[in-house]
């Protein structure tokens, strides 16, 4: 029996009956065995076929076999009901080998020319399966020359049998207090040859409850307990299961915070699997009772481990733990069934005793000593000498715990000293230097510090003076001895003040004329305002109308008198303002340098002389009465004049204060 070619030789060729294309002889038997490489099959077709026809091809025939299976027995020229001729059919081996047998019997009624056939090896497409047959691969099948391979969808791994896809279904950990888990692909059939492990791991103190829901279908056996596929549930205390079949298992209350669910499947079956809804419970905490004037949020039927509630107080009430304030309060339920902190109180907001108002007082409106939410107090300033700045002095205890004005301010009102009050009533004419009486010049300040000088009180902690009077002390402000509230220069009865800082106008040049001869002294403490100590007003924008030529101003001080000595008693003089050109001309002739009188100066005095300020009066105020406000204001600061005070044809020269209002306001607001 001749052998056909064997792999790895090229597998293709021609077969023919003996003597072809001539007639074949009687009693012939020929056998060909064709072998293809693994993963290949053999294809065979006939180009000529002419054999004796006999019932069931008993006489002459060609038989095609593959392994133990006969693929076809062929005879004749054309097929009949009981006999088959190949015609145009193509034949395929079942595996990689094909046996072809030719046989003729002892006689032929007429000559037959036999057969000619061609064969070739071709790749088997293992991925194509006949209807009803099991697929080659579980998921994806990939054909290639000489073979095939299987692959799996994401979440699966190829089993070692190279065909089944096992689910990658282990290591899932559920940490939420409730959730759902199910067999892979649920509710579609679960995968074969898989071993799934799911863990529920909750915080200590929780207990997991398992409920099987919807449907349950796991391969079972009528006699043996779950021999094929099964579901097991394990806790640190006990094991539940195995479960299989079609009946939903009952609820499982595990009494454990950790649960392991194992699901194992074999290589066969077509079942939909299972679905579990899990919840958890824990020892409940005592029901939180809201404190008076507070409420609990959220409101729940019960509170278990990790549940929390917050307390919110009504408006006007605040969270307090004893004396300690809290902005917020949240308590958390612990595993032992206790709250992690005790309930606070919602106490009515208490703004506390209101701060004392310097130079003022406070009155309880709601009731004596009542300082709680919505209580009202009224601040007022000491009458006559102080006036309230900005607000009306009415404050309410608000929910934030602060006393708040009707304008929403939380700071105290300010009692500002009333300026320009004097006991003196001005006579309309000029008369000689006079002794001042108590309360006539309550703004008068005596400055001692090397020399005697004067100043005027502004507000309750500033003194306005001449730059030349305090120039030597500009770097040693504490050396200035400042006295006020007295008429007698040498009296031991006075109000003492000390300087914190001296501010000399940056445009002043010492020993080079008296332009910008102005300075401010900041006191280290506020002085108490009374009838003997009252600040002078600063000039209003409209003040120029009260300081025209011939308008009367008043200068006061303890400077040299006609006798040539410093005055013991405070003296004053009423003097008219002198025309600026006239004054400039008076100081144009020697010994005065040209330009001695500037636009920052004003002059006052009599052409005939005799009424003037003098050495020792420096820095004092030349004041004018504002007839609209009936308050005195400072128009000038005693600055300089002729060597001989009160000399005829010469005038006292004063710093023109109205030119320095921005400078004064800037210094005071900045410091």
């Amino acid at each position: 029996t001749p052998l056909g070619p064997k792999w790895p030789e090229p597998v293709f060729g021609r077969l023919a009956s003996p003597g072809f294309p001539g007639e074949y002889a009687n009693d012939q038997e020929r056998r060909w065995t064709l072998t293809a490489p693994p993963g290949y099959r053999l294809r065979l077709y006939f180009t000529h076929f002419d054999l004796e026809l006999s019932h069931l091809c008993e006489y002459d025939f060609v038989k095609l076999s593959s392994g133990a299976k006969v693929l076809a027995t062929l005879c004749g020229q054309e097929s009949t009901d009981t006999e088959r001729a190949p015609g145009k059919d193509t034949f395929y081996s079942l595996g990689s080998s094909l046996d072809i047998t030719f046989r003729s019997d002892y006689s032929n009624e007429k000559p037959f020319t036999g057969f000619e056939a061609f064969y070739a090896a071709e790749d088997i497409d293992e991925c194509q399966v006949a209807p009803g047959e099991a697929p080659t691969c579980d998921h994806h099948c990939h054909n290639h020359l000489g073979g095939f391979y299987c692959s799996c969808r994401a979440g699966y791994v190829l089993h070692r049998n190279k065909r089944t896809c096992s689910a990658l279904c282990s290591g899932q950990v559920f940490t939420q207090r409730s959730g759902e888990l199910s067999s892979p692909e649920y509710p579609r059939p679960y995968p074969k040859l898989s071993s799934c492990t799911y863990s529920i791991s909750l915080e200590e103190g929780f207990s997991v409850i398992l409920d099987f829901v919807e449907s349950f279908d796991v391969e079972t056996h009528p006699e043996t307990l779950c021999p094929y596929d099964f579901l097991k549930i394990q806790t640190d205390r006990e094991e539940h299961g195995p479960f299989c079949g079609k009946t939903l298992p009952h609820r499982i209350e595990t009494k454990s915070n950790t649960v392991t669910i194992t699901f194992v499947t074999d290589e066969s079956g077509d079942h939909t699997g299972w679905k579990i809804h899990y919840t958890s419970t824990a020892q409940p905490c005592p029901y939180p009772m809201a404190p008076p004037n507070g409420h609990v949020s959220p409101v729940q039927a019960k509170y278990i481990l990790k549940d929390s509630f917050s307390i919110f107080c009504e408006t006007g009430y605040e969270l307090l733990q004893g004396h300690l304030p809290l902005k917020s309060f949240t308590a958390v339920c612990q595993k032992d069934g206790s709250w992690d902190r005790p309930m606070p109180a919602c106490s009515i907001v208490d703004c506390g005793p209101p701060d004392d108002l310097p130079s003022g007082r406070v009155e309880y409106i709601t009731g004596p000593g009542v300082t709680t939410y919505k209580a009202v107090i009224q601040y007022s300033c000491e009458e006559t000498f102080y006036t309230m700045k900005v607000n009306d002095g009415k404050y309410v205890c608000e929910a934030d715990g602060f006393w708040t004005s009707s304008k929403g301010e939380k700071s105290l009102p300010v009692c500002e000293p009333v300026c320009g009050l004097s006991a003196r009533t001005t006579g309309g004419r000029i008369y000689g230097g006079q002794k001042a009486k108590p309360g006539d010049f309550p703004w008068q300040v005596l400055i001692l510090g090397g020399t005697t000088a004067a100043g005027a009180l502004l507000y309750d902690n500033w003194v306005l003076t001449a730059a030349h009077a305090v120039y030597e002390q500009k770097h040693d402000a504490s050396a200035l001895d400042i006295r006020m509230g007295t008429l007698k220069r040498l009296s031991p009865h006075y109000t003492q003040a000390w300087s914190e800082a001296v501010f000399i106008h940056e445009g002043y040049t010492h020993d080079a004329g008296f332009d910008n001869d102005i300075a401010l002294i900041k006191l280290n403490n506020k002085v108490v305002i009374n009838s003997n100590i009252t600040p002078i007003c600063l000039p209003r924008k409209e003040a120029e109308s009260f300081m025209r030529t011939d308008d009367i101003g008043t200068a006061s001080g303890w400077g040299l008198t006609q006798r040539g000595f410093l005055a013991r008693n405070l003296m004053y003089v009423d003097i008219p303002i002198v025309d600026h050109q006239k004054c400039t001309a008076a100081y144009e002739k020697p010994p005065y340098p040209r330009g001695s009188v500037t636009a920052n100066m004003l002059c006052a005095g009599l052409e005939s002389g005799g009424k003037d300020s003098c050495r020792g009066d420096s820095g004092g105020a030349l004041v004018f009465l504002d007839s609209e406000t009936e308050r005195w204001f400072v128009g000038g600061i005693v600055s300089w004049g002729s060597m001989n005070c009160g000399e005829a044809g010469q005038y006292g020269v004063y710093t023109k204060v109205i030119n320095y209002i921005p400078w004064i306001e800037n210094i005071i607001s900045d410091f």
């Epitope: 300690l324 005790p342 715990g401």
Partner: antibody, heavy 115, light 107 residues
Framework: EVQLQESGPGLVKPSQTLSLTCTVS?????????WNWIRQPPGKGLEWIGY???????SYNPSLKSRVTISRDTSKNQFSLKLSSVTAADTAVYYC????????WGQGTTVTVSS | DIQMTQSPSSLSASVGDRVTITCKAS??????VAWYQQKPGKSPKALIY???YRYSGVPSRFSGSGSGTDFTLTISSLQPEDVAEYYC?????????FGQGTKLEIK
């Protein structure tokens, strides 16, 4: 982590004002709680000085109230203590602390009152 | 002011002993009491608040109890590292006040 750190001069002259600052990190002083000053004289127990709350309200020990001011600078997350007219009796380790549910203390700063 | 009186002012005990420190308030402070531990040269460290609530990180051997005027700090099994001064504190009302302290030593 919440941290409190006191800073200020270690030596103050009698009659002057003691000034200390507490810098808080890891928590905003406006978020919640009361921010306290506590002191401990050498070899003695603890004395509460006062607090400033998350809202800026203050509470002082009545025995020190006339001399104490507690303030804050929210932009720097700091609160401060000023104690005026000090005497030798004010010599102590001064601590800043937040008490109750959140409890953290600074490491303390020693202040000596001496001329 | 509310006085907080601690007793004893000092005590000596062996490792493993159960130790109790008491604190008596001069008036009702509800449960607004804290306990502090202070080691030499260190800041106080809070152990207990609201009379019986342990701060996180504080060993479970420390426990507190009481309400009203009588309060107790208990160390169930004394350890060498527990050597310190212990203070009670009330924060029920102004001024907050501390006990005078209890010095705890190991025998």
């Amino acid at each position: 982590e919440v941290q409190l750190q006191e800073s200020g001069p270690g030596l103050v002259k009698p009659s002057q004002t003691l000034s200390l600052t507490c810098t808080v990190s890891g928590y905003s002083i406006t978020s919640d709680y009361a921010w306290n000053w506590i002191r401990q004289p050498p070899g003695k127990g603890l004395e509460w000085i006062g607090y400033i709350s998350y809202s800026g309200r203050t509470s002082y020990n009545p025995s020190l109230k006339s001399r104490v001011t507690i303030s804050r600078d929210t932009s720097k997350n700091q609160f401060s203590l000023k104690l005026s007219s000090v005497t030798a009796a004010d010599t102590a380790v001064y601590y800043c602390a937040v008490l109750y549910a959140l409890d953290y203390w600074g490491q303390g700063t020693t202040v000596t009152v001496s001329s | 002011d509310i006085q907080m009186t601690q007793s004893p002012s000092s005590l000596s005990a062996s490792v493993g002993d159960r130790v109790t420190i008491t604190c008596k308030a001069s008036q009702n402070v509800d449960t607004n009491v804290a306990w502090y531990q202070q080691k030499p040269g260190k800041s106080p460290k809070a152990l207990i608040y609201s009379a019986s609530y342990r701060y996180s990180g504080v060993p479970s051997r420390f426990s507190g109890s009481g309400s009203g005027t009588d309060f107790t700090l208990t160390i169930s099994s004394l350890q060498p590292e527990d050597v310190a001064e212990y203070y009670c504190q009330q924060y029920n009302s102004n001024p907050l006040t501390f006990g005078q302290g209890t010095k705890l030593e190991i025998k």
